[in-house]
């Protein structure tokens, strides 16, 4: 018996071939011997089966001795043994229809779980293997679960159902709702304007929700809400903003915040959350601000950084075009009795400069100038 696998909602064509290459009488029946369709001369006739409005054949092939049964918009319950009667012969074809669906919406928040459920006919014992867009393979039976979805899981999932050494492939498009970056860090000199950007990693027609930026300053004992906002059809409107600092927010996507001045008291970490309409859970992006200050007080030239720097970073003080006078894994370094000239304070990672601030040290009888 020939086995054919079909996909729920698809169309399947079951073949039936006569030895004579001409139009002769044929009938397609199901396992209960109920006629599905057949022919009378050159006319297609249909029986009383449940497939009535979904069954068809190709009259153009009859003259070549081919009498296919076409079933449209397949249902799981169409799984059956179909019998083609032609030239006193019976050809049996077993059709097995499978369906694969995502548990809920195919738009899921980062960190949520995706469950794929296989619908299969009674008596079948299929195995399923799914390949994620990032190439991860997941195997299972009737259900497949992927916990903690990541941004890279966005895209087309390809799932292969295997039964009787035959396979059928399903493609499911999954959209993981997330920010493009889970975390970002901004390095600024004291006094510079700071731009924070929170681009989304997905596009949807209408985007509605509300958001808030909580900030934990390094110098503060507790975090505070810096700004709350609403999002209506991709338009941003500020609901509430602190007086210090007075953040400004762009009116369009991507979400964009401006801090007028980088100051040591603002250095720290923030968490922007975005709650989307009709979605449980929130999107998160961490943002970090590191602020640098170079100062000269009497005979002491000091370079300091505030904020979440990593213990890998080097802080250096050097006279322009000379070797570093001091270079340490610290958040503050200093030079006593610095010689006159342009000094550079550098925050670097394996030689790559992340942040630089210059300070001019004048001969001892005059005061320093900050460019």
């Amino acid at each position: 018996k020939k086995v054919v696998l079909g996909k729920k909602g698809d169309t399947v064509e079951l073949t039936c071939t006569a030895s004579q290459k001409k139009s002769i009488q044929f009938h397609w029946k199901n396992s209960n011997q109920i006629k599905i369709l057949g022919n009378q001369g050159s006319f297609l006739t249909k029986g009383p089966s449940k497939l009535n409005d979904r069954a068809d054949s190709r009259r153009s092939l009859w003259d070549q001795g081919n009498f296919p049964l076409i079933i449209k918009n397949l249902k799981i319950e169409d799984s059956d043994t179909y019998i083609c009667e032609v030239e006193d012969q019976k050809e049996e074809v077993q059709l097995l229809v499978f369906g694969l669906t995502a548990n809920s919406d195919t738009h899921l928040l980062q960190g949520q779980s995706l469950t794929l459920t296989l619908e299969s006919p009674p008596g079948s014992s299929p195995s399923v293997q799914c390949r994620s867009p990032r190439g991860k393979n997941i195997q299972g039976g009737k259900t497949l679960s992927v916990s903690q979805l990541e941004l890279q899981d966005s895209g087309t999932w390809t799932c292969t159902v295997l039964q009787n050494q035959k396979k059928v492939e399903f493609k499911i498009d999954i959209v993981v709702l997330a920010f493009q970056k889970a975390s970002s860090i901004v390095y600024k000199k004291e006094g510079e304007q700071v731009e924070f950007s929170f681009p989304l990693a997905f596009t949807v027609e209408k985007l509605t929700g509300s958001g808030e930026l909580w900030w934990q300053a390094e110098r503060a004992s507790s975090s505070k809400s810096w700004i709350t906002f609403d999002l209506k059809n991709k338009e941003v409107s500020v609901k509430r903003v602190t007086q210090d600092p007075k953040l400004q927010m762009g009116k369009k996507l991507p979400l964009h915040l401006t801090l007028p001045q980088a100051l040591p008291q603002y250095a720290g970490s923030g968490n922007l959350t975005l709650a989307l309409e009709a979605k449980t859970g929130k999107l998160h992006q961490e943002v970090n601000l590191v602020v640098m200050r170079a100062t000269q007080l009497q005979k002491n030239l000091t370079c300091e950084v505030w904020g979440p720097t990593s213990p890998k970073l080097m802080l250096s003080l050097k006279l322009e075009n000379k070797e570093a006078k001091v270079s340490k894994r610290e958040k503050a370094v200093w030079v006593l009795n610095p010689e006159a000239g342009m000094w550079q304070c550098l925050l670097s990672d394996s030689g790559q400069v992340l942040l630089e601030s210059n300070i001019k040290v004048l001969p001892t009888w005059s005061t320093p100038v900050q460019p």
Epitope: T309, S310, D349, S350
Partner: antibody, heavy 129, light 113 residues
Amino acid sequence: QVQLVQSGAEVKKPGASVKVSCKASGIPFTSDDINWVRQAPGQGLEWMGIINPSGGSTSYAQKFQGRVTMTRDTSTSTVYMELSSLRSEDTAVYYCARERYEGGYSSGPGNYYYGMDVWGQGTTVTVSS
Amino acid sequence: DIVMTQSPDSLAVSLGERATINCKSSQSVLSSSYNKNYLAWYQQKPGQPPKLLIYWASTRDSGVPDRFSGSGSGTDFTLTISSLQAEDVAVYYCQQYYSIPYTFGQGTKLEIK
């Protein structure tokens, strides 16, 4: 398996240059720094410099400044150390070593530094007239 | 540059006995900002590259036997091998990575008595 494979032994004349390669395999090449350390016969270890394969940024010991150049080729996961104006005291075994650093910002959970945890087999450079 | 000085230069210890190697830095390698001692210990056997034993002055690298331990803070550090095994015969180096340039101690040769 994580490893660094270095180029073969070299014999050079004083004044010449030598270029030693260090190919990484089984290592996420751009995420970790590569140090160069040398060891003269019967002597201790001497740090020459560091390169970040991701951006190509470098930091050299002052002793080698102007004579050493560290470069990388991300397409082949290889870093190079070129030492010019060779003299007899440059005769040594030259090692590349992966300096592994893991962990986020200091505000986040633990910052883990793993030192120079993977070393190349060493390349012997002999400088002789 | 930070100068690292090890003592003794060589050491002979009986199998199963404790071996202690000291390392002194010319300035503190304890970062007050990150509260970490930027000090590592390496083991080098003849004809082989060095092998990382300890980082952050006291954290054992993965796969390093627990007979090796590191201690100390600021400028004074110690590597201890609680019960010497034959395979521990090697030269041991301390190294600071607090400041560029990184610097190594001159090495301590450990032998079996």
